[in-house]
């Protein structure tokens, strides 16, 4: 996963709705007990902002040595600074844990600009505003890395909460959810609620400042507003789901629906932007440079490198237009839509020279590697990850930013057929290179 | 592509001066302002001066009385001339302009672009 700015053919037939919204009680099936409810001691314990990453409180070791980590679902290894670095205020010193066991075995991971390495090991691991429950997991030290810790960030390390198939050096590597699950009672599921600010934070508003939860193991009822919608995990690497159809404003971008899920789409809350392949991406943009044409943009600021900047409180939300991605639903025939705002697309920067202004920067991109759901989306929506049940939440977030006229929204059912046609098979090769 | 071309940095002696000087090109958009900014090592980037599309300027005060902007519109340039330096002016030294893309090129929107910065260095 990149942190910062991370990601034969057929048409799925979109569309036609079935008819109104169940009530939350009847459109989700009963859960198993202990999976919903309240997590007082779980809400708001993330901090941090889409651009820099989500980080929870960790300890590791023993005694506990105290830990700020990056929250990813796009990476599937448990890493931590372990060597001084110009940018870690603390780092885990492994020889001061008196239960720390070293693996003897290094793990070397690239990505498309930078990389990170270090040495396996195990040791206690705890969440204090999670589970009461310590585990024994497998941490990557990490001794050495180049453009992979951000100046300013506040975290020191990387939780990869996807699966084995994806952790470095091989699948064997337990994941650290894995471990938990294995080794408690914490029922197999995990749901994030990411909470943008919709206005740029500086050092300390991010410190002072709320970004989320991470509830671990259920569902909090007071994270979301309205019903729950369910797409299956394709596939247990990446959290892989299936688009069945986009639409910008209303208006279908009518490509094939394989195009939207080449060569994946994945859930991931350590990318920044909303990713899509090269042809959706230049389809999107296009319609939304249609729907926005009242103004006249760099080049610049649609490949994202270039901020536009309004007098403070003048920022025209209204010629921005909604995107609305429909995923597989859990019924044959059967999608529902996650609806986001430009106030989800467009992300809030601040620079010295634009301070008093309302500033931002395009967080749509181009991917050669599929579709990426990254911060952008995931701000949205309160996102469950039911692994137990092989599936992936979505419901409104009851923290998104929206305004007085739209708000995000989460709608279904349709009916949608021949879905499984957009699902692309990569073709069986080595997976060991990170693209991310 | 916009460009913005910086030139004039170097070394003097406390009391010397120097004029800066940073040419915009490769956009058609109505420039709204040019400004200097700079930063020296260790601390943040702050506004030296500024200059709006209508000639109205704007001056850091540890600079008022010393240093001068100006611009010549005709060649999208800003210029900023640096009298009576002081081993406190010591920094990188950045151009910035305001690009307007609100409609009809107003400044009610607009783009901020940066120089790659010159470096002055005033010695006691």
């Known amino acids: 996963t990149q942190h910062g700015i991370r990601l034969p053919l057929r048409s799925g037939l979109g569309g036609a709705p079935l008819g109104l919204r169940l009530p939350r009680e009847t459109d989700e099936e009963p859960e198993e007990p202990g999976r919903r409810g309240s997590f007082v001691e779980m809400v708001d314990n993330l901090r941090g902002k889409s651009g820099q990453g989500y980080y929870v409180e960790m300890t590791v070791g023993s005694p506990p040595q105290t830990l700020n980590i990056l929250v990813d679902t796009g990476s599937s290894n448990f890493a931590v600074g372990a060597a001084p670095h110009p940018f870690l205020h603390r780092y885990y010193q492994r020889q001061l844990s008196s239960t720390y066991r070293d693996l003897r075995k290094g793990v070397y991971v690239p990505y498309t600009q930078g990389k990170w390495e270090g040495e396996l090991g195990t040791d206690l691991v705890s969440i204090p505003h999670g589970p009461n429950v310590t585990v024994r997991a497998n941490i990557a030290a990490i001794t050495e890395s180049d453009k992979f810790f951000i100046n300013g960030s506040n975290w020191e390390g990387i939780l990869g909460l996807a699966y084995a198939e994806i952790a470095r050096p091989d699948d064997s590597l337990e994941p650290f959810f894995d471990s938990l699950v294995k080794q408690t009672h914490v029922p197999n599921l995990f749901s994030l609620q990411l909470c943008g600010a919709g206005f740029p934070l500086n050092q300390s508003e991010v410190l002072a400042s709320v970004g989320g939860s991470m509830i671990i193991g259920g569902i909090d009822h007071s994270l979301y507003t309205g019903s729950l919608w369910y797409t299956p995990i394709r596939r247990e690497w990446y959290y892989e789901v299936i688009i069945v159809r986009v639409e910008i404003n209303g208006q279908d971008l009518k490509m094939d629906c394989k195009e939207y899920n080449y060569d994946k789409s994945i859930v991931d809350s350590g990318t920044t932007n909303l990713r899509l392949p090269k042809k959706v991406f230049e389809a999107a943009v296009k319609s939304i440079k249609a729907a926005s044409s009242t103004e006249k943009f760099p080049d610049g600021f649609w490949l994202g490198e270039q901020l536009v900047c309004w007098q403070a409180g003048t920022t025209p939300w209204n010629i921005f237009p909604v995107i609305s991605l429909y995923l597989m639903g859990e019924v044959t025939n059967q999608s529902f839509r996650i609806t986001i705002l430009p106030q989800q697309y467009l992300r809030p920067v601040e620079d010295v020279a634009t301070s008093q202004d309302d500033c931002y920067k395009f967080a749509i991109s181009q991917s050669s590697t599929g579709t990426v759901m990254g911060a952008v989306i995931m701000e949205g929506f309160y996102v469950v990850f039911d692994r137990a049940r092989k599936r992936i939440g979505f419901a409104v977030s009851a923290c998104h930013v929206h305004d007085e006229f739209r708000t995000a929204a989460v709608e279904g059912p349709f009916v949608t057929l021949d879905m499984e046609d957009c699902g692309y098979n990569i073709p069986q090769t080595d997976e060991s290179t990170l693209m991310t | 592509q916009v460009q913005l071309q910086e030139s004039g940095g170097g070394s003097v002696q406390a009391g010397g001066f120097l004029r800066l000087s940073c040419a915009a090109s490769g956009y058609t958009y109505s420039t709204c302002s040019m400004a200097w900014y700079r930063q020296a090592p260790g601390k943040e980037r702050e506004l030296v001066s500024s200059i709006r599309n209508d000639g109205s300027t704007a001056y850091a005060d540890s600079v008022k009385g010393r240093f001068t902007i100006s611009q010549d519109n005709a060649k999208n340039t800003v210029y900023l001339q640096m009298n009576s330096l002081k081993p406190e002016d010591t920094a990188m030294y950045y151009c910035?302009?305001?690009?307007?893309?609100?409609?009809?090129?107003?400044?009610?929107?607009?783009?901020?672009?940066w120089g790659e910065g010159t470096q002055v260095t005033v010695s006691s």
């Open positions: 910035n302009i305001r690009i307007g893309v609100g409609p009809g090129g107003t400044c009610s929107i607009y783009a901020p672009y």
